[in-house]
Interface confidence: low
């Protein structure tokens, strides 16, 4: 499919001008290559009319130009003094006319309306309001006032001062007679439809002395604004419909076959399933304007979008609308990253987030998409050292691997973590990406003790058991803090006995804390990685207390300390059962503690996005 994009249809009137913008991927080659505008012939060829290399056909001499804007990947063709002969099929493109790097454009030039003398022209957008003013003389002040529409050869009464309203205008028209000082009456038509366009005649009086005024009403269908975005990227539709619809329900819909427009999202709470997890309807301003953000753009998102206002929250005749034609460029600069990541309860996930590598110094964010109302995405963590309180000890945002990708690690997973998450930066807003976390059946691969208590001044050894599948991975221990996880020295204690059907390649790697101090209290993670790419992690909270008896603590021998809701493994260490981690500030022995995350986050269900790009929690 050609990555060139422009307007499919351009309509104008004889004598007017048009400006046609064509978009291309702004690669170095594309920015400098030839741009052209050609007319398609009946037998298939395409005759150049104007190009960026200076050529201008005699047909266009003195009335056309082509301007390239390499910095934003567009070029613009301006054509003036249009005639009906200019109607036809054209291409805007790059390189050689026959190469296929082009976009088809249909140009339709129509004859200007043949208007009667003294005709007032009203040009109004679809769905808006028009006021037709009708002057009259004093002698007709007390006589019947009326508005007719010319249908074919015959005038058809639309409204009059005796109270008649044509059924086609019911509920959206009124006739106002100004105060006695002004010799003027007005007809106001709301929620204009395309079918309202045409010639009108307003009249005061019915005899030969009546006053008449001709009006031509042109109802404009909004020209779609062209939007060119990268696959996997993000688009924002800004919709400003005016204060008169500030209190009317708003919607964004996507045109399907014919005139159907399927609601994507509206302010009444409707959202199309295909956009679950990747759409936000941003707050309405007092003037009724709003915006819709869609992330994780897919090929099938391309098409015509309309935003509008109607009490039903969907497109109806007479809705004021704004239009966009979205083109999704498959030659995307945004790298592929998994759209679904799977983890098990008690386990972990490592999510790779792409960002614009030109903005390495930008602040990185990760937020949790919530579907309630119109959608929101509260931040959970950022690269400046802020972590939402409920996620302390189990969430970290790492700048690694860098060069256009950062990593988010979330461990101690529960079913409540299933959902959609957005990767963001405070830089290029087009690089918002979405990932869905799914919680699947299974056991965590890494095995660590439950929360551990260390004694001041003594030595503590904490084991982490790695199965054979991680034999080729680098194994590490680190201490979590709100800016990341600082690596700590660890010892390889040889093969682990914690895994059934696992050979000598399984590993027991221990963290040793010598001469424990108060500063050692906190969350510790063991994990695996390959270079700068992170895999699974497991977390242990180490509490520090005053000395009770002499000696060092080797947690692997703490069989007797096992709490009732933990299961003791043969190797003599504790594994946390698939439960939410308790508040670390309450020690492991104090069991009757509610899960603070449950209270704060409420219940969220996972919705399958149907994505084929899936990733397990333990591999990259």
């Amino acid at each position: 499919k050609s990555p060139i994009f422009g307007p499919e249809e351009v309509n104008s009137v004889e004598g007017n001008s048009v400006s046609i913008t064509c978009y291309y991927p702004p690669t170095s080659v594309n920015r400098h290559t030839r741009k052209y505008w050609c007319r398609q012939g009946a037998r298939g060829g395409c005759i150049t009319l104007i190009s960026s290399e200076g050529y201008v056909s005699s047909k266009y001499a003195g009335r056309a130009n082509l301007t390239n804007f390499p910095e934003n990947g567009t070029f613009v063709v301006n054509i003036a003094q249009l005639s009906q002969d200019d109607s036809g099929r054209y291409k805007c493109g790059l390189g050689i006319n026959s190469r296929g790097l082009s976009f088809d454009v249909s140009l339709e030039v129509s004859q200007g309306p043949g208007l009667l003398n003294d005709t007032k022209v009203y040009t109004v957008d679809l769905g808006r309001t028009v006021t037709i003013n009708c002057p009259f003389k004093t002698e007709n002040a007390q006589k019947r006032k009326s508005l007719y529409k010319q249908i074919g050869l015959y005038p058809v009464l639309v409204i009059d001062s005796s109270g008649y309203v044509n059924p086609n205008y019911t509920g959206r028209i009124r006739l106002d007679i100004q105060g006695t000082g002004q010799l003027l009456f007005s007809v106001v038509i709301n929620q204009l439809r395309l079918s309202d366009a045409g010639q009108y005649l307003c009249q005061a009086g019915d005899d030969s002395n009546s006053n008449k005024k001709n009006a031509d009403l042109q109802v404009l269908k909004p020209e779609p604004e062209l939007v060119y975005e990268d696959l996997r990227g993000s688009v924002t539709f800004h919709c400003a419909l005016g204060p008169e619809v500030a209190n009317v329900a708003k919607f964004l819909c996507r045109q399907s076959s014919g005139e159907n427009c399927d609601v994507v999202v509206n302010t009444l709470g409707k959202r199309a399933p295909a956009f679950e997890g990747r759409i936000l309807l941003n707050p309405q301003d007092k003037d009724g304007s709003f915006s819709v953000v869609i992330t994780g753009l897919r090929k099938e998102d391309a098409g015509r979008y309309l935003c509008g206002a109607h009490s039903d929250g969907q497109l109806q005749e007479g809705s004021p609308i704004q239009a966009w034609q979205l083109f999704v460029n498959e030659e995307s600069t945004i790298p592929r990253s998994p759209t679904v990541v799977k983890g098990v309860a008690g386990g972990s996930v490592a999510v790779l987030c792409p960002y614009n590598r030109k903005e390495s110094k930008s602040i990185k964010y990760w937020c949790l998409w919530e579907g309630a109302q119109n959608g929101r995405c509260p931040l959970l963590v950022d690269s400046e050292g802020w972590v939402k309180a409920q996620y302390e000890g189990r969430l970290s945002l790492l700048e690694e691997p860098g060069n256009g990708t950062f990593t988010v690690i979330l461990n101690q997973l529960t079913s409540r973590d299933a959902g959609f998450y957005w990767c963001l930066t405070n830089g290029d807003t087009l690089w918002r990406t979405t990932v869905e976390i799914k919680i699947i059946e299974g056991e965590p691969n890494l095995k660590v003790p439950g929360n551990v208590t260390a004694v001041l001044g003594e030595t503590l050894k904490v084991p982490c058991h790695f199965p054979c599948k991680f034999s080729s991975y680098e194994k590490y221990w680190c201490k979590w803090n709100n800016t990341g996880c600082q690596a700590l020295p660890s010892q390889d204690e040889g093969p682990s006995k914690a895994f059934v059907n696992c050979d000598e390649n399984s590993r027991l790697v221990s963290l040793t804390l010598n001469l424990v101090t108060r500063a050692d209290e906190g969350w510790y993670w063991c994990g695996v990685k390959q270079g700068h790419f992170y895999g699974e992690t497991a977390a242990v909270y180490v509490a520090v207390e005053e000395r009770k008896a002499a000696g060092s603590r080797d947690v692997s021998l703490a069989k007797a300390d096992a709490a009732p809701d933990e299961k003791v493994l043969d190797s003599g260490f504790r594994e946390i059962e698939n439960k939410a981690i308790q508040d670390p500030r309450l020690f492991a022995e104090e069991k009757a503690v509610a899960d603070t995350r449950d209270q704060a986050d409420g219940s969220r269900a996972s919705v399958d996005s149907g994505s084929s790009e899936e990733q397990g929690g333990s591999s990259r």
């Epitope: 936000l280 309807l281 941003n282 707050p283 309405q284 007092k286 915006s291 953000v293 602040i363 937020c367 109302q373 119109n374 959608g375 929101r376 995405c377 509260p378 931040l379 950022d382 400046e384 050292g385 802020w386 939402k388 957005w422 963001l424 405070n426 807003t429």
Partner: nanobody, 128 residues
Framework: EVQLVESGGGQVQAGGSLRLSCVAS???????????RAWFRQAPGKERELVSA????????YYVDSVKGRFTVSTDDAGDTMYLQMNSLEPEDTAVYYC??????????????????WGQGTQVTVSS
């Protein structure tokens, strides 16, 4: 927990100016990190109303109609302090002014209940 502290309130004649400041208690905390920051006001016996709001990294700034052209919101270079410059003050501007911030990336800006962090408020009195 982050706390916001306002200053700059006071008494002024109609037509005068005031500049309100809002500083975050933690130096590590920057307004640039926030999804939205705002100034609200509450006149006696009335509901708290939004005066101005800026979404995350200043992409969109809103002003209530009654202050448009008179009030301007800004942030210092470091992002530690938010300001509300109030010019051509009118008696109807008399109220307690609050700065607020939140970390949610979207939802209704006009609803004060969606804001996580609040200042204690500073009184502005405009006499005719």
């Amino acid at each position: 927990e982050v706390q916001l502290v306002e200053s700059g309130g006071g008494q002024v004649q109609a037509g005068g100016s005031l500049r309100l400041s809002c500083v975050a208690s933690e130096r590590t905390f920057s307004y640039y990190d926030l999804a939205a920051r705002a100034w609200f006001r509450q006149a006696p016996g009335k509901e708290r109303e939004l005066v101005s709001a800026s979404t995350w990294n200043g992409g969109y700034t809103y002003y209530v109609d009654s202050v448009k052209g008179r009030f301007t919101v800004s942030t210092d270079d470091a992002g530690d302090t938010m300001y509300l410059q109030m010019n051509s003050l009118e008696p109807e501007d008399t109220a307690v002014y609050y700065c607020a911030a939140r970390r949610a990336y979207s939802s209704d800006l006009h609803d004060y209940r969606t804001f996580d962090y609040w200042g204690q408020g500073t009184q502005v009195t405009v006499s005719s």
